[in-house]
């Protein structure tokens, strides 16, 4: 029985050219996290973090993605095309798979504030 819940940074905004932290957190389960996959709205992989073997950063993002903090991901040099959904998929044992969603809006405005809060989707 899957008892866990994924908390995410929810809907966030950041300014063009800046950076943003994509963060998910799995709670309410004792399941062991074996791997976390980070994917973009079009199903393209940004990165995978294996609990023991570390990070795999996909080539299309290698110059713009920094691993961490923790199981999260930092997306840098934001463009308007980065606007959209991002998904964290937690592979766990014995529970199975948990998935969280974050919506990122990249704003042109130089005064855009980066708002981030943890919420349960």
């Amino acid at each position: 029985m899957m008892t866990g819940t994924i908390e995410t940074t929810g809907n966030i905004s950041a300014k063009k050219g800046g950076s943003v932290i994509l963060q998910c957190h799995l709670s309410s389960t004792m399941a062991q996290v074996t791997q976390v996959n980070w994917e973009q709205h079009d199903h393209s992989l940004l990165a995978i973090r294996n609990a023991e073997l570390g990070w795999h950063i996909y080539p299309a993002f290698k110059d713009r993605v920094a691993p961490g903090p923790g199981l999260g991901l930092t997306l840098q040099s934001l463009t308007m095309n980065d606007t959209g959904e991002y998904f964290c998929t937690y592979h766990t044992y014995p529970d199975g798979t948990y998935r969280g969603r974050i919506f990122l809006e990249v704003l042109e405005s130089s005064v855009a504030e980066h708002s981030a809060r943890f919420q349960i989707p």
Epitope: Q35, E39, L45, I48, N50, A51, H56
Partner: antibody
């Protein structure tokens, strides 16, 4: 130049154990993961597992848990794989392979170690 | 475990021909696929990573494509030295698994 030099061929009896080494040179050992791959005669490749030399963390293919143990010696930049309770099914060529930087593919391979289990 | 199926165990081709080797994953693996070449008596060599990226020093006659469950490895103009077995591998989830291999034979 990156090199992965594996220990020589082994002929062992059923039920015994064996430890295969993979001595590396030409790069910073702790910055890359190390993996072990099995190739039975005339067959495909099987990922046994990998180890992060930086912290000793290991990830195993469930099929090889209890069969293989992966370790490293940072001081000599050497990776080891111990295989125990050997049977004829374990007869194969075993490769060590380096995980590419921030990637999971294997960019450098050892020359292979042939293990023969026979009474 | 994710099963990687290379439907052709053998493929026969001539020097200068274009040849494509296919690999099918039992579930969606996005672009987490690698292609290796293993020549007779040698260790495998990395050719393509992340489905379509050519590894350093690999000739541009070798290309990879695909995403999801269907992947293709192509040699645009086969050379005699391309005689080898070609393996696909997924690293979308552990255990990382290989296809059964496709042996390329030169006529």
């Amino acid at each position: 130049e990156v090199q992965l030099q594996q220990s020589g061929p082994e002929l062992v009896k059923p039920g015994a154990s064996v430890k295969i080494s993979c001595k590396t040179s030409g790069y910073t050992f702790t910055e890359y993961t190390m993996h072990w791959v099995k190739q039975s005669h005339g067959k495909s490749l099987e990922w046994i597992g990998g180890i992060n030399p930086n912290n000793g963390g290991t990830s195993y293919n469930q099929k090889f848990k209890g069969k293989a143990t992966l370790t490293v010696d940072k001081s000599s930049s050497t990776a080891y794989m111990e295989l125990r309770s050997l049977t004829s099914e374990d007869s194969a060529v075993y490769y060590c392979a380096r995980g590419a930087y921030y990637r999971y593919d294997f960019d450098y391979w050892g020359q292979g170690t042939t293990l023969t289990v026979s009474s | 475990d994710i099963v990687m199926t290379q439907s052709h165990k053998f493929m026969s081709t001539s020097v200068g021909d274009r040849v494509s080797i296919t690999c099918k994953a039992s579930q969606d693996v996005r672009t987490a696929v690698v292609w290796y070449q293993q020549k007779p008596g040698q260790s495998p060599k990395l050719l393509i990573y992340s489905a379509s990226y050519r590894y350093t020093g690999v000739p541009d006659r070798f290309t990879g494509s695909g995403s999801g469950t269907d992947f293709t490895f192509t040699i645009s103009s086969v050379q005699a030295e391309d005689l080898a077995v070609y393996y696909c591998q997924q690293h979308y989830s552990t255990p990382w698994t290989f296809g059964g291999g496709t042996k390329l034979e030169i006529k």
